[in-house]
Each structure stands twice: as C-alpha cells, then as structure tokens.
Interface confidence: low
Amino acid sequence: IQGPESVRAPEQGSLTVQCHYKQGWETYIKWWCRGVRWDTCKILIETRGSEQGEKSDRVSIKDNQKDRTFTVTMEGLRRDDADVYWCGIERRGPDLGTQVKVIVDPEGAASTTASSPTNSNMAVFIGSHKRNHY
C-alpha cells in the first residue's frame, strides 16, 4: 500500500489523502486510523469491502476498486487533528498499512500547499512521496 508521507492543510480546511494498493486487495476492508504507533493506532473509519462510501463525523472514506485507490477526506480541520495517521487494508494476519503525517497550519499561517481551484481550503494529496510499510 502506498500513500503520501505527509500532508498539510489549513485549520478549518479539509484534506484528501489517496492511498494506492495492489491488485488482489480490491474487496478487502480499507481503513484510516490515528496514532503514532502502528500497533496502537485506532480506526477512525473503514469501508465495508465495497465501493460504497462511509462517513463518520468529519471523516469519510471511499474505495475506487477499479483504480485500486481509496480516498480519505478530513473536513473542518482543527489544530488537534495534527497527528500521525495510517491508511491500511484489513486482511488475515498483519494488516497492510502506510503512515501519513497530518500537519494542520493555524489560521492565518502561510501554507506551502497548493490549493484546489474549487475550494481554497481543500488540499488534495496523491502520494508524490511514497513509502511502503508492511
């Protein structure tokens, strides 16, 4: 599984993280969890192994099985959302996952992230800096 090493977005804005996976994992449960350590991170939201999107509070997840990419969106970002997150795939044995560091810039602070043309407070990341975690 591959995703961005870190993402940055403004406070009160939103961000979208795209995590890519290999063929064969299409119908597995995909998840997004929070926590510095892989073994103690906790699931915030997960798919049901289908392409049906799921939403919980300010976090949503959608799996595009044709493109083998699942997309996580966090909205209404707050400073205390800044943390280490993981996108992962549930399977028998150890789950697959990759770490994503989320940085939230305080309101008024300059952001180095290019804005989406449709929403000046939305940052989209597709993993230009990729890392693998198994």
């Epitope: 926590g35 510095v36 509070d57 205390d80 044995g93």
Partner: antibody, heavy 126, light 107 residues
Framework: QVQLVQSGAEVKKPGASVKVSCKAS????????VHWVRQAPGQGLEWMGI????????NYAQKFQGRVTMTRDTSTSTVYMELSSLRSEDTAVYYC???????????????????WGQGTTVTVSS | DIQMTQSPSSLSASVGDRVTITCRAS??????LNWYQQKPGKAPKLLIY???TLQSGVPSRFSGSGSGTDFTLTISSLQPEDFATYYC?????????FGQGTKVEIK
C-alpha cells in the same frame, strides 16, 4: 472524585426519541473520550459509540448509525446520547463511561472504560 | 464486527477456588482486551485493560493473559465478593464488542 452522573429513568412510546445526559466531574472534561454502552434486561453489554468531548467527533456502531446522536456541552461538562425511532428492543439500561486513556496521549487510543455512570433505564412501551 | 466468545457462560465455584474464564476473538485483536466485573443492578467495573494491566484498586488475585485471539482471566483464590458476571471486551476495532458474559456463582 471522578464521577459521571446520568439523568433519570425514561418511559417512551415506540417511534419516539430519548435523550440521556451524562454529567462529568472531578477531571478535565475535554481530555477523555466518553463511550455509551447499553444493557437490555437480563442481557449482556452492547457498545453504542464514542464521543470526543474536545472536538465533538463521534464514532457510532453500525447498528445504531442513523438513529443515535452523541453530543456534548463543554460549558456544563455534559455529554448526551439521543436515540430516535425507539422500539421495544431498545428497552435497556444505558451507561456512559469514561475512557481510561487521555486523548492527548498519542500512543494509546480508547483502551477501556474506567469510570461509569450509574445507568439510565429507558423503557419503550406502548 | 469482531465477535467475542466467552467460555464458560456460567460456572459454580467455592471460596478459595482458582477460577479461569476464557475469551476468544474472531480475529486477532493484538492486546486490546479488557475485562469487566458486573454485579446485579450495578454498572460494570473495569478490572484489567490491555490484556494484563490491573486497574488501580483491583486486588492482585485477578490476572489476565493472552494475545491475538485467545485470552484468559484468572482469579487465583475466589473471594465472596467475586461472585458476579465477567465480560471481556475488545478495543481494537470499532465497534468495541463485548463477550456474552460469564456468571460466577456460589457452589
């Protein structure tokens, strides 16, 4: 001392809604997540969901999605659980419970429930 | 959802007995396993969290072990106040499911 005090017993008709409150004291309200758990008469424990009192963020068990709403009022250190479209099977004792690990401990999340409210009996009957 | 299965569902024991309750998860939950004690008409009480960590104030006769899918709660020497129902609970994956409970009764 650390405690959670819940609102009193409720009797509701099928189709109605109930809102149970849980007032926290003795600790920093916004630092610990709060769970809701219910127990039908003579049955086991059933986890309903969790709320982050700092952000208001919630996670609900799929079974209750669309029927349950958990909210908080930081000014009164109170969390609320509202369950709608009540049916007879919702007759139960509803508990709020504080998580054991503070949310600002980034190495652990939602380990267990160390402080419980006294429970609120909700009876659904026509 | 992760299913938690406890055994036995009930047991009869005498004061001083060593009692063992097992809990099995339908998939690996690492060490995210908690044990609660509940007495009739009362709220549950946390005994052990993270498989083996004794909650503050809980007597040392209670202990927990296991990892992955199989876990055990042991009461080394049963006391009169220990007659109650015991529940395991996983806190690995939402929803945080409970076992069906084990009722410990006086023989």
């Amino acid at each position: 001392q650390v405690q959670l005090v819940q609102s009193g017993a409720e009797v509701k008709k099928p189709g109605a809604s109930v809102k149970v409150s849980c007032k926290a004291s003795g600790y920093t309200f916004t630092t610990y997540a709060v769970h809701w758990v219910r127990q039908a008469p003579g049955q086991g424990l059933e986890w309903m969901g969790i709320i982050n009192p700092n952000s208001g963020g919630t996670n609900y068990a799929q079974k209750f999605q669309g029927r349950v709403t958990m909210t908080r009022d930081t000014s009164t250190s109170t969390v609320y659980m509202e369950l709608s479209s009540l049916r007879s099977e919702d007759t139960a004792v509803y508990y709020c419970a504080r998580d054991i690990v503070p949310m600002n401990n980034f190495y652990n999340y939602y380990y267990g429930m160390d402080v419980w409210g006294q429970g609120t009996t909700v009876t659904v009957s026509s | 959802d992760i299913q938690m299965t406890q055994s036995p569902s009930s047991l009869s024991a005498s004061v001083g007995d060593r009692v063992t309750i097992t809990c099995r998860a339908s998939q690996s939950i690492s060490s995210y396993l908690n044990w609660y004690q509940q007495k009739p008409g009362k709220a549950p009480k946390l005994l052990i969290y993270a498989t083996s960590t004794l909650q503050s104030g809980v007597p040392s006769r209670f202990s927990g072990s296991g990892s992955g899918t199989d876990f055990t709660l042991t009461i080394s020497s049963l006391q009169p106040e220990d007659f109650a129902t015991y529940y395991c609970q996983q806190s690995y994956r939402i929803p945080y499911t409970f076992g069906q409970g084990t009722k410990v009764e006086i023989k």
